[in-house]
């Protein structure tokens, strides 16, 4: 029976040319972790496997760094960055848990615009 | 279900090469991560080297680092170690592990195959 529950980062906003971190926690379970993948749409960004170790995909090896913990950041955002990411937990013996994350990534002036405006 | 069998053990002199095989049945593993770990008498298991997206990423211990090759051959399903320049210290038995993939969630784990480096 699958007890467990994702909390992620949610719907999160960055700069073009910035970082950003996405994270995933895993609670309510003591299920163990065997491996985190890491998706945007149907690509595989990233893989952390509990006893084979971090491997980023070729294609994001220059703008993708593992960590901090199970999370991931990207680097160098640029607006094509803008969509859905996902923490895919294989547990066990659990099952495989999913977390979903919006990235929108914001041309610097909008950014900057939209920080302005905030309401305290 | 999914079989990880290794080969290419043996024993050979300090100094010598071996090249061990690991060959995936059952599931493919070119978007996973596969790799080696090895057991020496009276200790615990541990991590050698990993490889992924069929060689781009590689993933290696400091004790094997210079000495050590992980490759894969996606086409044949099958996961290489080239073990050079051999120690008496890397007598172990060596595993092939491959990361899970859905629905199983759990790394799996060939039966090993026996290397001795005699000096």
């Known amino acids: 029976m699958m007890t467990g529950t994702i909390e992620t980062t949610g719907n999160i906003s960055a700069e073009k040319g910035g970082s950003i971190i996405l994270q995933c926690h895993l609670s309510s379970t003591t299920a163990q972790v065997t491996q985190v993948n890491w998706e945007q749409q149907d690509q595989l960004l990233a893989i952390c496997n509990a006893d084979l170790g971090w491997h980023i995909s070729p294609s994001f090896k220059d703008r993708v760094a593992p960590g901090p913990g199970l999370g991931l950041t990207l680097q160098s955002l640029t607006v094509n960055d803008t969509g859905e990411y996902f923490c895919i937990y294989h547990t066990y013996p659990d099952g495989t848990y999913t977390g979903r994350i919006f990235l929108e990534v914001l041309e610097s002036s909008v950014a900057e615009h939209g920080a302005r405006f905030q309401i305290p | 279900e999914v079989q990880l069998v290794e080969s290419g053990g043996g024993l050979v002199q300090a100094g010598g090469s071996l090249r061990l095989s690991c060959a995936a049945s059952?599931?493919?593993?070119?978007?996973?991560?596969m790799g080696w770990f090895r057991q020496a008498p009276g200790k615990e298991r541990e991590f050698v080297a990993a490889?992924?997206?069929?060689?781009?990423?590689?993933n290696y211990a400091d004790s094997v680092k210079g000495r050590f090759t992980i490759s894969a051959d996606n086409a044949k399903n099958t996961v290489y170690l080239q073990m050079n320049s051999l120690k008496p210290e890397d007598t172990a038995v060596y595993y092939c592990?491959?990361?899970?993939?859905?629905?199983?969630?759990?790394?799996?784990w060939g039966q090993g195959t026996q290397v001795t480096v005699s000096s």
């Open positions: 592990a491959a990361g899970p993939k859905t629905p199983d969630t759990r790394n799996y």
């Open positions: 490889i992924s997206w069929g060689g781009a990423s590689t």
């Open positions: 059952g599931r493919t593993f070119s978007n996973n991560v």
